[in-house]
Interface confidence: medium
């Protein structure tokens, strides 16, 4: 009987539950378009359950299909600013290992000051996700305006 | 044997399954920027499985990490209207209990007439989510243009 | 004992796991506003686990509540182009069976070149989802700019 009880927890365990929601820490030095993220209860409402941060970039710990989502708001921005500084583009991709490097999600700001999107994508243990913001405008660090997260969906 | 069968349903039960998708009912009176929501099969494709509505605002019934998503389209709107009536901003946040009051998600319309975004966030039983639309433009009540929902993701 | 073990897998099975992420194959002939999708590992990062493609349209195989998401980027586009060719609108809906025909999600491009959104909606086995792009502008076929997917969330 005990065996059946222990066994029957396996489905829950196999669900993975891996999930992370990150807030912006800082932008990179010149020539480095990457956004650097941070997460953890001490910082507010950001968290990492499974994935880890590696020098501000998100590293996956469990193979599976993930829902990846992001919102980035430009800090000192109006529709005039946004169009004047066009093109400002955000791309989310696998940046490591190099053999799996690929762009997963790409958006341009055009005359807007916020982009937001999401997609399903297969990710493997060890994949590191990078978010590149190209252009001269800086992102807002407000935690309700700029965030990035992943949610494990299925094996 | 019956005990093992009953027990083994726990993982499914513990998944929570709490989910809601709401459609716009009406806007608030002057000085009240909140959007008031409604949901239920009789209204179309909106529903509440777990969360409840409290005076048009969504109240959470189960602790956990949720995916919160929203789309709001302005009713009589062109890019000219949107920019002329700027700033029009939508914010989603915990409005009650006041001790947990925080903005979760914020977007401005700039020259667009629709905003859409989503994020992962921890919510607790009793948290009430409010969606505040500031500005002079009114939202569309079309159910495919304006909607708001949450999905329980993990404990 | 074996019976208890077999039984306890049911919750996992009943989760459904149905999920699909599609990339744009082509647009329809004149007078057909539908986008035609494709998916599968041979094509890159698109996939179908449960749902199927029927002449480029997504057909659901399991009843339940689904998270539907989409991003469409216009191919040769600037904010000037987008506003000049306005209205360009994307709508996602159930197009078959005709008795269940309904629009689920609708967005206009206004002065932007990308739309992205998501929503929760009940879908039934046999429902076919169509994505209609109205206007004269063409969508980008880049897999990180235009994609469409569904994820089964609960019964």
């Amino acid at each position: 009987q005990r065996f059946a009880q222990a066994q029957q927890q396996l489905p829950l365990e196999s669900l993975g539950w891996d999930v992370a929601e990150l807030q912006l820490n800082h932008t990179g030095p010149q020539q480095d378009p990457r956004l650097y993220w941070q997460g953890g209860p001490a910082l507010g409402r950001s968290f990492l359950h499974g994935p880890e941060l590696d020098k501000g970039q998100l590293r996956i710990h469990r193979d599976g299909i993930y829902m990846v989502h992001i919102q980035v708001t430009l800090a000192i921005c109006s529709s005039t600013t946004a169009s004047r500084h066009h093109p400002t583009t955000l791309a989310v991709g696998i940046c490591s290992p190099a053999s799996r490097s690929i762009s997963l999600l790409r958006l341009s700001f055009h005359q807007g000051c916020t982009i937001a999107s999401q997609r399903l994508t297969p990710l493997a243990r060890g994949d590191t996700l990078c978010t590149n913001l190209t252009g001269t405008l800086l992102p807002s660090r407000n935690t309700d305006e700029t965030f990035f997260g992943v949610q494990w969906v299925r094996p | 044997q019956r005990f093992a069968q009953a027990q083994q349903q726990l993982p499914l039960e513990s998944l929570g399954w709490d989910v809601a998708e709401l459609q716009l009912n009406h806007t608030g009176p002057q000085q009240d920027p909140r959007l008031y929501w409604q949901g239920g099969p009789a209204l179309g494709r909106s529903f509440l499985h777990g969360p409840e509505l409290d005076k048009g605002q969504l109240r959470i019934h189960r602790d956990g990490i949720y995916m919160v998503h929203i789309q709001v389209t302005l009713a009589i709107c062109s890019s000219t209207t949107a920019s002329r009536h700027h700033p029009t901003t939508l914010a989603v946040g915990i409005c009650s209990p006041a001790s947990r009051s925080i903005s979760l998600l914020r977007l401005s319309f700039h020259q667009g007439c629709t905003i859409a975004s989503q994020r992962l966030t921890p919510l607790a039983r009793g948290d009430t989510l409010c969606t505040n639309l500031t500005g002079t433009l009114l939202p569309s009540r079309n159910t495919d243009e304006t909607f708001f929902g949450v999905q329980w993701v993990r404990p | 004992q074996r019976f208890a073990q077999a039984q306890q897998q049911l919750p996992l099975e009943s989760l459904g796991w149905d999920v699909a992420e599609l990339q744009l194959n082509h647009t329809g002939p004149q007078q057909d506003p539908r986008l035609y999708w494709q998916g599968g590992p041979a094509l890159g990062r698109s996939f179908l686990h449960g749902p199927e493609l029927d002449k480029g349209q997504l057909r659901i195989h399991r009843d339940g509540i689904y998270m539907v998401h989409i991003q469409v980027t216009l191919a040769i586009c600037s904010s000037t182009t987008a506003s000049r060719h306005h209205p360009t609108t994307l709508a996602v809906g159930i197009c078959s069976p005709a008795s269940r025909s309904i629009s689920l999600l609708r967005l206009s491009f206004h002065q932007g070149c990308t739309i992205a959104s998501q929503r929760l909606t009940p879908l039934a086995r046999g429902d076919t989802l169509c994505t209609n792009l109205t206007g004269t502008l063409l969508p980008s076929r880049n897999t990180d700019e235009t994609f469409f997917g569904v994820q089964w969330v609960r019964p």
Epitope: T73, S140, E145 | P87, T89, S103, N132, T134 | -
Partner: antibody, heavy 122, light 107 residues
């Protein structure tokens, strides 16, 4: 017309507790919409928000003072109160009570009391 | 916390002139900015909320504009009773913060 009136001692000794009460008339502290707040202004300086209370008893405090401040509400008397512990001369200020109108993002203050000067001195 | 910087610290103008007061936020506050007027010995009075909305009973000569990090309070034609100190306040992030104030004095 909503009116707010602060009351309490004008002189408090260092290390003691400053206690003020705000009485609301022409409106109810039990209103769904409003956040009842305390703001202070040291002589010749700017304004500093101390915290608010909602009718349910939920509070939100300025982190710079969180360890020393308590705001409470008495709906039966239509009053709310401020307690600031372990005061120093830096806490000398005009203390205002105000009604906050807003939401989870924050509030702005549409009705104010006339203010009461509290001096911290031995 | 969000720091609000008001400029100029003092504005010397004559009645009938146009006054333009600036408030800059250290990070975006969207449209969640208010303006107050304070006269000596009085409590502040709410003039503008959410960047551009006039509070009840405020004359039309007061107007607010801006979003994100840069905001402006404009008094189109100064009346004698408008000479006072003006504060901006953000309600975008906790804690709520006020600017240091701009004093509008008679030239």
């Amino acid at each position: 017309q909503v009116q707010l009136q602060e009351s309490g001692p004008g002189l408090v000794k260092p290390s003691e507790t400053l206690s003020l009460t705000c009485t609301v008339s022409g409106g109810s502290v039990s209103s769904d919409y409003y956040y009842w707040s305390w703001i202070r202004q040291p002589p010749g300086k700017g304004l500093e928000w101390l915290g608010y209370i909602y009718y349910s008893g939920s509070t939100n405090y300025n982190p710079s003072l969180k360890s020393r401040v308590t705001i409470s509400v008495d709906t039966s008397k239509n009053q709310f109160s401020l307690k600031l512990r372990s005061v120093t001369t830096a806490d000398t200020a005009v203390y205002y009570c105000a009604r906050g109108d807003g939401d989870f993002l924050g509030v702005c203050f549409d009705y104010w009391g006339q203010g009461t000067l509290v001096t911290v001195s031995s | 916390e969000i720091v609000l910087t008001q400029s100029p610290a003092t504005l010397s103008l004559s009645p009938g002139e146009r006054a333009t007061l600036s408030c800059r936020a250290s990070q975006s506050v969207s449209s969640y900015l208010a303006w107050y007027q304070q006269k000596p010995g009085q409590a502040p009075r709410l003039l503008i909320f959410d960047a551009s909305n006039r509070a009840t009973g405020i004359p039309a000569r007061f107007s607010g504009s801006g979003s994100g990090t840069d905001f402006t309070l404009t008094i189109s034609s100064l009346e004698p009773e408008d000479f006072a100190v003006y504060y901006c306040q953000q309600r975008s992030n906790w804690p709520l913060t006020f600017g240091g104030g701009t004093k509008v004095e008679i030239k």
